[in-house]
C-alpha cells in the first residue's frame, strides 16, 4: 500500500513539475525590467526564451520573437536546450510511469517490469528536474552578471552631454516557476525510485529445504515473505506447495474496485 502511494504521489508531483517546466519555458517573463532606483519609464520591458515584450502605460503590449538562431547569445541557446531536454525527458518519463503505475493493470505485466519502468521514469524525472534547475540557474547567473555590468555603466554618454539610460533586467516570474517546477520534478523522480525498491520482488538468499513428513513428501520453498537483504534475482517467487501464505504482491494483484482495467 505504501509503495503504491509513494509511486502515485511521485507520479503526481512529477506531473505538476513537468507542467511547471513547460509553463516556465513558454513564459515571457524570464527577465523583467528592474524598476528599483531607475528612472520611471512609461514602458515595462520583459523578455522570455523565445521573444521580448514591451507593455506600454496604456496597457498595449507588443511582443517580438527572436527570429534568428545564429544571432542569439550562446547562453540563451544553452538554456533553451536544457529546458527542451528537460521537457522531452519529463514527457517520456510520464509516459513510462503511467504504464508502471501499480494501480493500473496492463495485460499480464510482470511486477519486475513495472519496477524497472518505475526506476526508469524516476531517473528520467530526476534528470528532467536537474535540466530545468540548471537552465533556470544559468539564465539567472546571466542576469546577475548583466545587471551589475549595466549598473556599472548605467549612464553612458558622449562627453557627458547626452545620456543613455541602460535598461537593467532582474529575475522574472518564470525563473521562480522553473526552480519550483524543477524541484518538484526532482522530488517526484526520487519518490519513483524509492517506490521502485518496494515494487521489486526479491528471492531469499538461501536454498529450498526439503522436509520429510510421515504421510507424503512435500518440498517447501519459502516464499511467503521477502528477504530483507536486498540481494537475489527479481524473478517472481513461485510456491511448489500451495498451502502456504500468499506473497505481498499476489495479495495486491487481485482485482478490486480501485483497479483500472
Amino acid at each position: 500500500m505504501a509503495v503504491t502511494a509513494c509511486q502515485g504521489l511521485g507520479f503526481v508531483v512529477s506531473l505538476i513539475g513537468i507542467a511547471g517546466i513547460i509553463a516556465a519555458t513558454c513564459m515571457d517573463q524570464w527577465s523583467t525590467q528592474d524598476l528599483y532606483n531607475n528612472p520611471v519609464t512609461a514602458v515595462f520591458n520583459y523578455q522570455g526564451l523565445w521573444r521580448s515584450c514591451v507593455r506600454e502605460s496604456s496597457g498595449f503590449t507588443e511582443c517580438r520573437g527572436y527570429f534568428t538562431l545564429l544571432g542569439l547569445p550562446a547562453m540563451l541557446q544553452a538554456v533553451r536546450a536544457l529546458m527542451i531536454v528537460g521537457i522531452v525527458l519529463g514527457a517520456i518519463g510520464l509516459l513510462v510511469s503511467i504504464f508502471a503505475l501499480k494501480c493500473i493493470r496492463i495485460g499480464s505485466m510482470e511486477d519486475s517490469a513495472k519496477a524497472n519502468m518505475t526506476l526508469t521514469s524516476g531517473i528520467m524525472f530526476i534528470v528532467s528536474g536537474l535540466c530545468a534547475i540548471a537552465g533556470v540557474s544559468v539564465f539567472a547567473n546571466m542576469l546577475v552578471t548583466n545587471f551589475w555590468m549595466s549598473t556599472a555603466n548605467m549612464y553612458t554618454g558622449m562627453g557627458g552631454m547626452v545620456q543613455t539610460v541602460q535598461t537593467r533586467y532582474t529575475f522574472g516570474a518564470a525563473l521562480f516557476v522553473g526552480w519550483v517546477a524543477g524541484g518538484l520534478t526532482l522530488i517526484g523522480g526520487v519518490m519513483m525510485c524509492i517506490a521502485c525498491r518496494g515494487l521489486a520482488p526479491e528471492e531469499t538468499n538461501y536454498k529450498a529445504v526439503s522436509y520429510h513428513a510421515s504421510g507424503h513428501s512435500v518440498a517447501y520453498k519459502p516464499g511467503g515473505f521477502k528477504a530483507s537483504t536486498g540481494f537475489g534475482s527479481n524473478t517472481k517467487n513461485k510456491k511448489i506447495y500451495d498451502g502456504g501464505a500468499r506473497t505481498e504482491d499476489e495479495v495486491q494483484s487481485y482485482p478490486s474496485k480501485h483497479d483500472y482495467v
Epitope: P39, T41, A42, V43, Y46, S57, S58, G59, V165
Partner: antibody, heavy 120, light 113 residues
C-alpha cells in the same frame, strides 16, 4: 466621435482650491489612461498628471506633487483634478488628454481646455 | 527630468516649400526592449488644443496628411512638412513619451514667409 470636455475652471485666490472635471464620451473610458496637461499664457505645454485605466498607476509632475490629486470615476466616464494650495504660477489652460492605446504613449485626443486663473 | 529642446523657436517658410523642425532630448528615447523611439509631435493652432501628428518618432496619426513626416532616433528627431500649406501655420511641440514626467519641447512657431 471621441470627446473630452473639461469644466470647473475659474478665478481663485492664491492658497485656494479648485476641482476640475473632464467628461469623456465616444469611447470606452475605462480602457484608457488619461493625462492632465496645462499651458500657461504664451508658454509651452506642461504635463502635470496621469492616471491609468484602473487607477492603479498615478504619476505627477514634481511641480504639483502633494498639491494636486488626479482621480477618475469609470462608472461616470469622468476624470478629476483636485487642486489645492494654488499659486500664481498655476494659472493656465488645463487640458485633459487621452493616452492612446497603440500610439507609443502619445496623447491622441485632447479636450478644449478650461482656464484656471490664480490671482488676488 | 528629460529636457526637450526644439529649434528653431520660430520659422518662416514660403507656401509649397519644405519646413524642418528639430528636437533634441537630453536622454535617448529609444527603448531597448523593442527598439522603438518614444517621441511624439503635436500641432497646436491658435486658440485650439494640441493635435497628435506623429508618434513613435515616425508614425503618422490617423487623418494626418502625408506631407507631415517624422524621423530620427535616440536623441535627435526631426519633423518635416514637405510642402507647406496655409493651414499648417501653428505651433509644433515635441514630447518625450518614454520617461515620467512626460516632457514637452518649448514649441516652434511656424509662419508663412
Amino acid at each position: 466621435e471621441v470627446q473630452l470636455v473639461e469644466s470647473g475652471g475659474g478665478l481663485v485666490q492664491p492658497g485656494g482650491s479648485l476641482r476640475l472635471s473632464c467628461a469623456a464620451s465616444g469611447f470606452t473610458f475605462s480602457d484608457y489612461g488619461i493625462h492632465w496637461v496645462r499651458q500657461a499664457p504664451g508658454k509651452g505645454l506642461e504635463w502635470i498628471a496621469y492616471i491609468s485605466r484602473g487607477s492603479s498607476t498615478i504619476y505627477y509632475a514634481d511641480t504639483v506633487k502633494g498639491r494636486f490629486t488626479i482621480s477618475r470615476d469609470n462608472a461616470k466616464n469622468s476624470l478629476y483634478l483636485q487642486m489645492t494650495s494654488l499659486r500664481a504660477e498655476d494659472t493656465a489652460v488645463y487640458y485633459c488628454a487621452r493616452g492612446g492605446y497603440d500610439t507609443r504613449n502619445a496623447m491622441d485626443y485632447w479636450g478644449q481646455g478650461t482656464t484656471v486663473t490664480v490671482s488676488s | 527630468d528629460i529636457v526637450m529642446t526644439q529649434s528653431p523657436d520660430s520659422l518662416a517658410v514660403s507656401l509649397g516649400e519644405r519646413a524642418t523642425i528639430s528636437c533634441k532630448s537630453s536622454q535617448s528615447l529609444l527603448n531597448s526592449g523593442n527598439q522603438k523611439n518614444y517621441l511624439a509631435w503635436y500641432q497646436q493652432k491658435p486658440g485650439q488644443p494640441p493635435k497628435l501628428l506623429i508618434y513613435g518618432a515616425s508614425t503618422r496619426a490617423s487623418g494626418v496628411p502625408d506631407r507631415f513626416s517624422g524621423s530620427g532616433s535616440g536623441t535627435d528627431f526631426t519633423l518635416t512638412i514637405s510642402s507647406l500649406q496655409a493651414e499648417d501655420v501653428a505651433i509644433y511641440h515635441c514630447q518625450n513619451d518614454l520617461y515620467y514626467p512626460l516632457t514637452f519641447g518649448q514649441g516652434t512657431k511656424l509662419e508663412i514667409k
